[in-house]
């Protein structure tokens, strides 16, 4: 139920997983000089019931007199279960925040981790695309991709956006970011049939212009 | 847990200054967008500025833009407000909070949203006097 790749890359655009389907792994990778607790855990791990969801482990990092050489993992369902469940929600957190029915959220930050994160996402899998500071969509259709299951085989739909290189402050109104709310997406497909319709551009431009409350200044 | 810690509100005229500090010890800035909400009382909380702590860009709310300057110190894991010009409007509850960076260390203005963020301080108050 892994996604096998990488969500696709838009250029002059960037995407982000405002919540992630249980079941997803999040590796516990520390930045350079630092390294993984002993005995700490190797990963985060989305779970929960009908009612919650929350990120079983935490992930700590520690000073280190060797560079942390430690191979990425991707654990198996089996050492899943020997896990220990530590919540890991902020507890500054706004009362008004989105929640998603079987999604956890970002886990919040821990000291000394890596830059990066690397995630395992699966089947199922939401992630939204904005376009950066300077360019505009210009041709839109929905601006996410989708891990989907198709015979057998894990990839990720290509998402109906085209940014464009004149400079813009303004965004559109359907560029908000997206609310958490059960999206009603099937987790596989039946048919062997593959369409265009991932792939196919929607060539009609907003009409209308919201102005954003932010500016931007490059250092 | 990291924690963000927000230190230098206070009592100021209009048309004062003020400088507002964010220390998170520990936190690899470079993985995230860093900055200011603030909340009025009796008004939702609202973003007023923040910086991308991979490539330095900075965003403003249009009342605040001209009058406040945010900056940030990687080596010492700080993220400063300096706020001139001061009005009696930009007297809140002012909180530090952070958001990871979306794909190849980009931000967009549309993301910093109080329900999204990861991690938040728990305030520091400014007052200001007519």
């Known amino acids: 139920e892994l996604c096998d790749d990488d969500p696709p890359e838009i250029p002059h655009a960037t995407f982000k997983a405002m919540a992630y389907k249980e079941g997803t792994m999040l590796n516990c990778e520390c930045k350079r000089g630092f390294r993984r607790i002993k005995s700490g855990s190797l990963y985060m791990l989305c779970t929960g019931n009908s009612s919650h969801s929350s990120w079983d482990n935490q992930c700590q990092c520690t000073s280190s007199a060797t560079r942390n050489t430690t191979k990425q993992v991707t654990p198996q369902p089996e050492e899943q279960k020997e896990r220990k469940t530590t919540e890991m929600q902020s507890p500054m957190q706004p009362v008004d925040q989105a929640s998603l029915p079987g999604h956890c959220r970002e886990p919040p930050p821990w000291e000394n981790e890596a830059t990066e994160r690397i995630y395992h996402f699966v089947v199922g899998q939401m992630v939204y695309y904005q376009c950066v500071q300077g360019y505009r969509a210009l041709h839109r259709g929905p601006a996410e991709s989708v891990c989907k299951m198709t015979h057998g085989k894990t990839r990720w739909t290509q998402p109906q956006l085209i940014c464009t290189g004149e400079m813009e402050t303004s965004q559109f109104p359907g560029e908000e970011k997206p609310q958490a709310s059960p999206e009603g997406r099937p987790e596989s497909e039946t048919s062997c049939l593959v369409t265009t319709t991932d792939f196919q551009i929607q060539t009609e431009m907003a009409a209308t212009m919201e102005t954003s409350i932010f500016t931007t200044e490059y250092q | 847990q990291l924690q963000l810690v927000e230190s230098g509100g206070g009592l100021v005229q209009a048309g004062g200054s003020l400088r507002l500090s964010c220390a998170a010890s520990?936190?690899?800035?470079?993985?995230?967008?860093i900055g200011w909400f603030r909340q009025a009382s009796g008004k939702e909380r609202e973003g007023v500025s923040y910086i991308n702590g991979r490539d330095g860009s900075t965003f403003y709310a249009d009342s605040v833009k001209g009058r406040f300057i945010i900056s940030s110190d990687n080596a010492k894991n700080t993220v400063d407000l300096q706020m001139n010009s001061l009005k009696p409007d930009d007297a809140a509850v002012y909180y530090c909070?952070?958001?990871?960076?979306?794909?190849?260390?980009?931000?967009?203005?549309?993301?910093?949203?109080?329900?999204?963020?990861?991690?938040w301080g728990k305030g520091t108050l400014v007052t200001v006097s007519p």
């Open positions: 520990g936190l690899t800035f470079d993985g995230y967008a």
């Open positions: 909070a952070v958001d990871r960076l979306g794909s190849r260390g980009a931000y967009v203005s549309t993301w910093w949203r109080p329900p999204d963020m990861d991690l």
